[in-house]
């Protein structure tokens, strides 16, 4: 299955001190993504 997002990207940092963005990484580490088989609710963005 294609990775919906590239988790190697650090994400979007908006302000100093803010943690990395949920986007670009978190979907890959969701339960749906871990199941591997069946429909993934997050299709590739590219």
């Amino acid at each position: 299955l294609a990775d919906p997002l590239d988790h190697r990207d650090a994400g979007d940092l908006w302000f100093p001190g803010e943690s990395e963005s949920f986007e670009d990484a978190h979907v890959e580490h969701s339960i749906s993504r871990s199941l591997l088989e069946g429909e993934i609710p997050f299709p590739p963005t590219s």
Partner: antibody, heavy 115, light 112 residues
Framework: EVQLVETGGSLVQPGKSLRLTCATS????????LHWVRQSPEKHPEWVAH??????????YYAESVKGRFTISRDDSKSSVFLQMNSLKEEDTAIYYC??????WGQGTLVTVSS | DVVLTQAPLSVSVTPGESASISCRSS???????????LYWYLQKPGMSPHLLIY???NLASGIPDRFSGSGSETDFTLKISEVEPEDVGVYYC?????????FGAGTKLELK
């Protein structure tokens, strides 16, 4: 079938400690990032804490309201996530959910902090 | 923190009619990659929140296409085209762009 089952909620006095457990099954656990989200009666959900995977050095993040009092941890061998809650306050009273914050949420466990 | 303001606080709808819920963010939720980090959940009475829409406009798996999400960088709308009895509950918007992740105060949908 994916399951997230929270346990450990109870009635405790202010200043006391409590440890919540989220036992999971039905999916490969080790690479999943998990959260605790709480919801006070008639209020909106409030994100509490987040733990990443071993590949991310088990990085943790906390809401300011619980930082220094709550500790999130995980045991990959038991497919479980924990929330150690110390110095509990009355405002910590809520249903605590274990979730990947997207599709999958547990049924929640009720924590009541009252004297 | 990112503040999400929902309106209205409650809405009463006749089954078969449409309903719209607004969510306004205190800052842009658009990333440099063009992803908008706005999510919609429905929480039915006595249940956990349930994902409806991810990234502003994408329907989650198993959600009927009566639900749709739209918006800009800071203003978002959830529309239910033909409300059904099972749609009753509290709708929340949420952002997962930056910590702390935050939720709106909720909009309660009731049937007339």
């Amino acid at each position: 079938e994916v399951q997230l089952v929270e346990t450990g909620g109870s009635l405790v006095q202010p200043g006391k400690s409590l440890r919540l457990t989220c036992a999971t099954s039905g999916f490969p656990f080790s690479n999943v990032w998990l959260h605790w989200v709480r919801q006070s009666p008639e209020k909106h959900p409030e994100w509490v804490a987040h733990i990443k995977a071993k590949s991310d050095n088990y990085a943790t993040y906390y809401a300011e309201s619980v930082k220094g009092r709550f500790t999130i941890s995980r045991d990959d061998s038991k497919s479980s996530v924990f929330l150690q809650m110390n110095s509990l306050k009355e405002e910590d009273t809520a249903i605590y959910y274990c979730t990947d914050i997207l599709e999958y949420w547990g049924q929640g466990t009720l924590v009541t902090v009252s004297s | 923190d990112v503040v999400l303001t929902q309106a209205p606080l409650s809405v009463s709808v006749t089954p078969g009619e449409s309903a719209s819920i607004s969510c306004r963010s205190s800052r842009s939720l658009l990333t440099s990659k063009g992803i908008t980090s706005l999510y919609w959940y429905l929480q039915k009475p006595g249940m956990s929140p349930h994902l409806l829409i991810y990234r502003m406009s994408n329907l989650a798996s198993g959600i009927p296409d009566r639900f749709s999400g739209s918006g800009s960088e800071t203003d978002f709308t959830l529309k239910i085209s033909e409300v059904e009895p099972e749609d009753v509950g509290v709708y929340y918007c949420a952002q997962f762009l930056v910590y702390p992740y935050t939720f709106g105060a909720g909009t309660k949908l009731e049937l007339k």
